[in-house]
């Protein structure tokens, strides 16, 4: 690496992946192993994030970018940059302090994460229920009863619940 020549700040020419080494007369030195600098002009390199335990490595650390973690199977990410991993539940359940609990009647969860939500109120939009809701599925709304042709049945039984359903994101 060549010594920087900037008169104002000799460190400003140090590219990402290096740091301005005060101990070596402000020469641009490469980041040591397990550290990175994502922008130029850094006076130190940041320590790479380590994906341990319930976290697993999604992207390895490089000299210019931090490692990225996601969660091991059975868990999903929470928080910015996957700062936490939370246990998955099955569809039709939500995670409580006491573990995974089935959704109450009138609510559903079609994912392995998140909360049980109330079935959609079709009448809010002047529609009727076309397909009944279940613990795993929301209702499907359809035309208002007035829009249906005479003799047509308005409600379809729910489709049978199947895994994997909505995949955790």
């Amino acid at each position: 690496f060549e010594r920087t020549r900037s008169l104002q700040d000799p460190c400003s020419n140090c590219p990402a992946g290096t740091f301005c080494d005060n101990n070596r007369n402000q020469i641009c030195s490469p980041c040591p192993p397990n550290s990175f600098s994502s922008a130029g002009g850094q006076r130190t390199c940041d320590i790479c994030r380590q994906c341990k335990g319930v976290f697993r490595t999604r992207k390895e650390c490089s000299s210019t970018s931090n490692a990225e973690c996601d969660c091991t199977p059975g868990f999903h990410c929470l928080g910015a940059g996957c700062s936490m991993c939370e246990q998955d539940c099955k569809q039709g359940q939500e995670l409580t302090k006491k573990g995974c609990k089935d959704c109450c009647f009138g609510t559903f969860n079609d994912q392995k994460r998140g909360i049980c939500r109330p079935w959609t109120n079709c009448s809010l939009d002047g529609k009727s229920v076309l397909v009944n809701g279940t613990k795993e599925r929301d209702v499907v709304c359809g035309p208002s009863p007035a829009d249906l042709s005479p003799g047509a049945s308005s409600v379809t039984p729910p489709a049978p619940a199947r895994e994997p359903g909505h995949s955790p994101q």
């Epitope: 079709c122 397909v131 209702v139």
Partner: antibody, heavy 119, light 107 residues
Framework: QVQLVQSGAEVKKPGASVKVSCKAS????????INWVRQAPGQGLEWAGN????????NYNQKFKDKATITADKSTSTAYMELSSLRSEDTAVYYC????????????WGQGTTVTVSS | DIQMTQSPSSLSASVGDRVTITCQAS??????LNWYQQKPDKTAKLLIY???RLRSGVPSRFSGSGSGTDFTFTISSLQPEDIATYFC?????????FGQGTKLEIK
């Protein structure tokens, strides 16, 4: 009537960010999912993610997880999608859509916002 | 992710023709299949939801059928205003995915 009105076209430089807005009217904003869909020039449709404005619960397509941030402002009935670290491949029309009554289909579409990324 | 394979990618037909588009899902999606019309001005419109349910205000010449992995969209008698690109979309499993589209032209 139910309407989604999106912000105007944007031209951005690579590396920049852009925040596209989608103002909803004619219905209870907090009771329906808002989806975001991308259409690159001459390409098909790609679902980026969605938000339930009542509690701001979001889902993302893994492909957009590091690219898009979806938010909603209940006070103005407006949903947003912010795109970061823009690259030329992000050049596309971005649509917001509202569900039909349950999340499984999209009944109302905004007019689309063209985002062009060019140096 | 669930792949949606739509065919044909384009087709040319005459006014009054019966037009059929198919969509195949890479896994069972029950009946959570929707069809959209996108006109050249880029506005998109939901025509059919939950495989076969016609949205209010949509002409009855449009219909849909199928279940599981194989789905069909039909225009019984093509009209000039039907010139558009048609997309299928599965709403069964996140992330929602679309077919690549069928561009319909008048002969």
């Amino acid at each position: 009537q139910v309407q989604l009105v999106q912000s105007g076209a944007e031209v951005k430089k690579p590396g920049a960010s852009v925040k596209v807005s989608c103002k909803a009217s004619g219905y209870t904003f907090t009771s329906y999912w808002i989806n975001w869909v991308r259409q690159a020039p001459g390409q098909g449709l790609e679902w980026a993610g969605n938000i339930y404005p009542s509690d701001s619960y979001t889902n993302y397509n893994q492909k957009f997880k590091d690219k898009a941030t979806i938010t909603a402002d209940k006070s103005t009935s407006t949903a947003y999608m912010e795109l970061s670290s823009l690259r030329s491949e992000d050049t596309a029309v971005y649509y917001c859509t509202r569900d039909y009554g349950s999340a499984y289909s999209m009944s109302t579409w905004g007019q689309g916002t063209t985002v062009t990324v060019s140096s | 992710d669930i792949q949606m394979t739509q065919s044909p990618s384009s087709l040319s037909a005459s006014v009054g023709d019966r037009v059929t588009i198919t969509c195949q899902a890479s896994q069972d999606i029950s009946n959570y299949l929707n069809w959209y019309q996108q006109k050249p001005d880029k506005t998109a419109k939901l025509l059919i939801y939950y495989t076969s349910r016609l949205r209010s205000g949509v002409p009855s010449r449009f219909s849909g059928s199928g279940s599981g992995t194989d789905f069909t969209f039909t225009i019984s008698s093509l009209q000039p205003e039907d010139i558009a690109t048609y997309f299928c979309q599965q709403g069964d499993t996140l992330p929602y995915t679309f077919g690549q589209g069928t561009k319909l032209e008048i002969k």
